[in-house]
Every structure is written in structure tokens, then in C-alpha cells.
């Protein structure tokens, strides 16, 4: 049995530069305890878009939707979208550790990708 | 329906050790968090220990780290808490606990009674 | 540790009223819009019933007279109208990414 799911239903997502794009992320439980953030791209160059915790992300939104009983919602919504936004997002679980937290899971990833604002 | 039923509960001595168990059915027992929850007439209720639902990561507060032990067999449908150098503070009611995220303790057992006293 | 502040200690209100219970949590215990705020009830010599989780939601089978409200820190626990069998004692859950995690010190209600 998997200790927890990371759940990121949408594989791609496209939007309108200049609008808002929901990104949707669910985990089946706290346990482990520890943070969630989102990421986008994978590996060492990797990009913080946002943890609840600290920085600050004044474009970023919590998107708390789901109300169902098995799941956990962690979305979060980007605002006033631009090309340069375009990419794989990540909602990544992390496990608190000592001294640092450890990331634990990862969910599959949403493609962002830009559409030019309608004329 | 969910059962959880606790046993183990009993009298003993200051520094003696208990082991509490508790036996689950009517749920998929290993997808669930379980937990421990104390109940004492002075200071309401207290959150004891949690274990994830496959068993490897477990938290305790601070009162009874070290001292108390929580594991679990999914194959057997149940939950154990092992509790060493028991002080007359451990004194309480000791409900089992499940949870299907963790965050909110979702069906409570019975109880099992544990009086450590002299 | 996040401390929780609950009030009343106790409470009488008559039959068909509005009852209302409030938590404080020492820090917020909000999550990405989740609010890890609980709401249980104790009836005497039973265990603790889970009524609202997650601050706001209905648990399964129990009465829409029941709802919870509130976010971050302060929270509330509403029964309206107060029936006989909500005679019990109420408390509150904070389960954060903080541990440990905490209840509130309970509220016993009466009927006036």
C-alpha cells in the first residue's frame, strides 16, 4: 500500500495569456507530516513557485475546492499568465526531517502551456 | 460498520510497562492512519501517537516520546502501543483511532482503562 | 505548540435555540485553503464522535443542525436549534503540519 497519493488529475492545462490557470493537486493523507510546494520543471534547476510556509508569490492563490472526504486539495491558481509561464508544474510532498525536510513524492505534473491573448 | 476494540488496559505500578492493542474490522484497515487518544478527567483529551497507514513513519508529543511504541499488522487487522516507564500521568482512558487522512480522528473505540498508581 | 482556547466551559441554552462554541488556535492552522480545524462530540460514557472536520464539512449521518465556520485561528461550532440529544460535551482539534497536535479544553452543554 502506498503511504500516500499524490494526485494531479490534469496532465495539460492551456490558457489565455493574461488569465488565471488552475492547478489542481489532491493527496490522500498528511501522513508523513511535512510541507507541501509546487515546482516547476524537474531536477536541480527546478523553480519555487510556491510554499505555503514562507517567500512570497504575490501571483499565487490556494485553490481549496475539493470538500471530499478522502482527499486533501493543495491547487493553487497562477494569475495574469504570460508565455513565459509555460511549462510542467509539480506538486511535490515533502517529509519533515532533520535538519532539512526530504521530499517524499511528487505528483506526475501539469503541462502549462500559453495561448495568445484573443485580439 | 467500524469496530475498534481496545484491550490491554489494567493497573500497574509506576515505571512498569502495559501494551495496549486494538483490533479493527469493517474498513480497509491498511489505508488508514490509526492513532491513540488519551482521555484524563484533568486534562481533557490528548493526542498520543500516530502511525501512517503502511507502518513506517510514526509521531508522538513530546510527553511520551521514548517511552511509548506504536505499530501496527495489516495483516491481522491491528494496532499496537507499547508503553515502558509509565508514570502516574499515563493514567487515563485510551481510545484507538481511525483516520482516513490523517487529519481528523474519523471512528474512536470504546476505550481500555490504564491506572498507573502504587 | 499551537494552544487551543476554547469557550465557553460551559453553556445552557433552552430547546430550539442557537448554541454556539468558539476555538482559538494559538497560530493559524490553515493549509493551502484547508483549515485543519475538527469538531467532536462526548456524550457520557461513549467515546468521542466525529461532527465537522476540516472546519466546515458534515461528517457523514449527522444532522444539518450542525455546522462549523472560521479560518486561520479563530473558529466556531454552531447547533441550531439545540435538540435534547445534543446534550454533551464538545471539543475542537487542531491537526496542522505542527505537532503536536491539540484539543480544545471542551464545552459542556446544557439544557436552560
Known amino acids: 500500500e502506498d503511504e500516500l497519493q499524490v494526485i494531479q488529475p490534469e496532465k495539460s492545462v492551456s490558457v489565455a495569456a493574461g488569465e488565471s490557470a488552475t492547478l489542481r493537486c489532491a493527496m490522500t493523507s498528511l501522513i508523513p507530516v511535512g510541507p507541501i510546494m509546487w515546482f516547476r520543471g524537474a531536477g536541480a534547476g527546478r523553480e519555487l513557485i510556491y510554499n505555503q510556509k514562507e517567500g512570497h508569490f504575490p501571483r499565487v492563490t490556494t485553490v481549496s475546492e475539493l470538500t471530499k472526504r478522502n482527499n486533501l486539495d493543495f491547487s493553487i491558481s497562477i494569475s495574469n499568465i504570460t508565455p513565459a509561464d509555460a511549462g510542467t508544474y509539480y506538486c511535490v510532498k515533502f517529509r519533515k526531517g532533520s535538519p532539512d525536510d526530504v521530499e517524499f513524492k511528487s505528483g506526475a505534473g501539469t503541462e502549462l502551456s500559453v495561448r495568445a491573448k484573443p485580439s | 460498520e467500524v469496530q475498534l476494540v481496545e484491550s490491554g488496559g489494567g493497573l500497574v505500578k509506576p515505571g512498569g510497562s502495559l501494551r495496549l492493542s486494538c483490533a479493527a474490522s469493517g474498513f480497509t484497515f491498511s489505508s488508514y492512519v490509526m492513532s491513540w487518544v488519551r482521555q484524563t478527567p484533568g486534562k481533557g483529551l490528548e493526542w498520543v501517537a500516530t502511525i501512517s497507514s503502511g507502518g513506517t513513519y510514526t509521531y508522538y508529543p513530546n510527553s511520551v516520546k521514548g517511552r511509548f511504541t506504536l505499530s501496527r499488522d495489516n495483516a491481522k487487522n491491528s494496532l499496537y502501543l507499547q508503553m515502558n516507564s509509565l508514570r502516574a500521568e499515563d493514567t487515563a482512558v485510551y481510545y484507538c483511532v481511525s483516520s482516513m487522512t490523517g487529519s481528523s480522528f474519523d471512528y474512536w473505540g470504546q476505550g481500555t482503562t490504564v491506572t498507573v498508581s502504587s | 505548540d499551537i494552544v487551543i482556547t476554547q469557550s465557553p466551559a460551559s453553556l445552557a441554552v433552552s430547546l430550539g435555540e442557537r448554541a454556539t462554541i468558539s476555538c482559538r488556535a494559538s497560530e493559524s492552522v490553515d493549509s493551502y485553503g484547508n483549515s485543519f480545524m475538527h469538531w467532536y462530540q462526548q456524550k457520557p460514557g461513549q467515546p468521542p464522535k466525529l461532527l465537522i472536520y476540516?472546519?466546515?464539512n458534515l461528517e457523514s449521518g449527522v444532522p444539518d443542525r450542525f455546522s462549523g465556520s472560521g479560518s486561520r485561528t479563530d473558529f466556531t461550532l454552531t447547533i441550531n436549534p439545540l435538540q435534547a440529544e445534543d446534550v454533551a460535551t464538545y471539543y475542537c482539534h487542531q491537526s496542522s503540519e505542527q505537532l503536536p497536535w491539540t484539543f480544545g479544553g471542551g464545552t459542556k452543554v446544557e439544557i436552560k
Open positions: 476540516r472546519a466546515s
